[in-house]
């Protein structure tokens, strides 16, 4: 099939005292090969500081996955979710407050 770029959605949730968990979800993409990782100050975080979900079919012939990491509250702006798919990339910052935002990466 043809390439379908991911929808990327970044959310934040309260973790332990002084920390938040930021989660980056990519959905509705094809083919299934994707890079999804958190970057701090422009550089990818090490694998052991991130948690990944499996790349799973979402029932529409496309796929979904996620990556999460725990960060200090107040440091959110230093972090960006980096997505790479089919030779294209996009970057997705952490929203302020408790809001969330959808980004659609267009190839």
């Amino acid at each position: 099939g043809s390439t379908v770029p991911p929808m990327v959605n970044v959310t934040r949730s309260e973790a332990s005292e002084g920390n938040i968990t930021v989660t980056c979800r990519a959905s509705s993409f094809y083919p299934r090969n994707i890079i999804l990782t958190w970057r701090q100050d422009g550089v990818s975080l090490s694998h052991d500081t991130q948690q990944w979900g499996d790349v799973l079919p979402d029932g529409n012939g496309t796929y979904q996955t996620w990556v999460a990491t725990r960060i200090c509250r107040g440091e959110e702006q230093r972090f960006t979710c980096y997505m790479e798919h089919s030779g294209n990339h996009s970057t997705h910052p952490v929203p302020s407050g408790n809001s969330h935002h959808h980004h659609h990466h267009h190839h």
């Epitope: 890079i35 970057r39 701090q40 100050d41 422009g42 550089v43 990818s44 702006q77 230093r78 972090f79 960006t80 790479e84 030779g87 294209n88 990339h89 996009s90 970057t91 910052p93 929203p95 302020s96 809001s99 935002h101 980004h103």
Partner: antibody
Framework: EVQLVQSGAEVKKPGSSVKVSCKAS????????IEWVRQAPGQGLEWIGA????????NYNEKFKDRATLTADKSTNTAYMELSSLRSEDTAVYFC??????????WGQGTLVTVSS | DIQMTQSPSSLSASVGDRVTITCRAS??????LAWYQQKPGKSPKLLVY???TLADGVPSRFSGSGSGTDYTLTISSLQPEDFATYFC?????????FGQGTKVEIK
């Protein structure tokens, strides 16, 4: 010291192409995205796109998607921006910049591209 | 695309004056805003990022503030070397967009 050094000024004919280079030094080239921005004479700044020098993956402004090609050579720590089908409105200074998280922290000195018949 | 409306487009001021430049985004950019100073024939120089964080080496007379859609750059006491053009830029979503610039001239 982080440095981005760009190639020299170019004069091009309408319909031709130009390739501007941006040589990085003072940091790990493949770790950071390189962004490209242009500034027409007396005008504001316009984002062209970005490249991950490590993988070659790109992100283009839709306005430039059909005419701009971003590449990078890891062996020489150099990023390139090629713009095709040049027209007079493409006369501008072209800048490369390093993406540090969520802002551009270092910029090249700029390359003036003049499109004239 | 997010539009960045910067005002004023130019201003005349004297050394020692307090100068305020504003930037309004067409949508919430979650404080992902940078301010740059540019002098003729030079590349932009980063002054402020994340709306209010001063870049390394930038004098404390510069300050940034704002959230949501409205942002301000303030120069508390204008110095001779501050006469230049100032731009804002949003980093919330691509295409990254810039304000049209504010030229600060000598009165």
């Amino acid at each position: 010291e982080v440095q981005l050094v760009q190639s020299g000024a170019e004069v091009k004919k309408p319909g031709s192409s130009v390739k501007v280079s941006c040589k990085a030094s003072g940091y790990a080239f493949t770790n950071y995205l390189i962004e490209w921005v242009r500034q027409a004479p007396g005008q504001g700044l316009e984002w062209i796109g970005a490249i991950n020098p490590g993988s070659g993956a790109t992100n283009y402004n839709e306005k430039f998607k059909d005419r701009a090609t971003l590449t990078a050579d890891k062996s020489t720590n150099t990023a390139y921006m090629e713009l095709s089908s040049l027209r007079s409105e493409d006369t501008a200074v072209y800048f490369c910049a390093r993406f540090l998280g969520n802002y551009f922290d270092n910029w090249g000195q700029g390359t003036l591209v003049t499109v004239s018949s | 695309d997010i539009q960045m409306t910067q005002s004023p487009s130019s201003l005349s001021a004297s050394v020692g004056d307090r100068v305020t430049i504003t930037c309004r985004a067409s949508g919430n950019i979650h404080s992902y805003l940078a301010w740059y100073q540019q002098k003729p024939g030079k590349s932009p120089k980063l002054l402020v990022y994340y709306a209010e964080t001063l870049a390394d080496g930038v004098p404390s007379r510069f300050s940034g503030s704002g959230s949501g859609t409205d942002y301000t750059l303030t120069i508390s006491s204008l110095q001779p070397e501050d006469f230049a053009t100032y731009f804002c830029q949003q980093f919330w979503t691509t295409p990254y967009t810039f304000g049209q610039g504010t030229k600060v001239e000598i009165k």
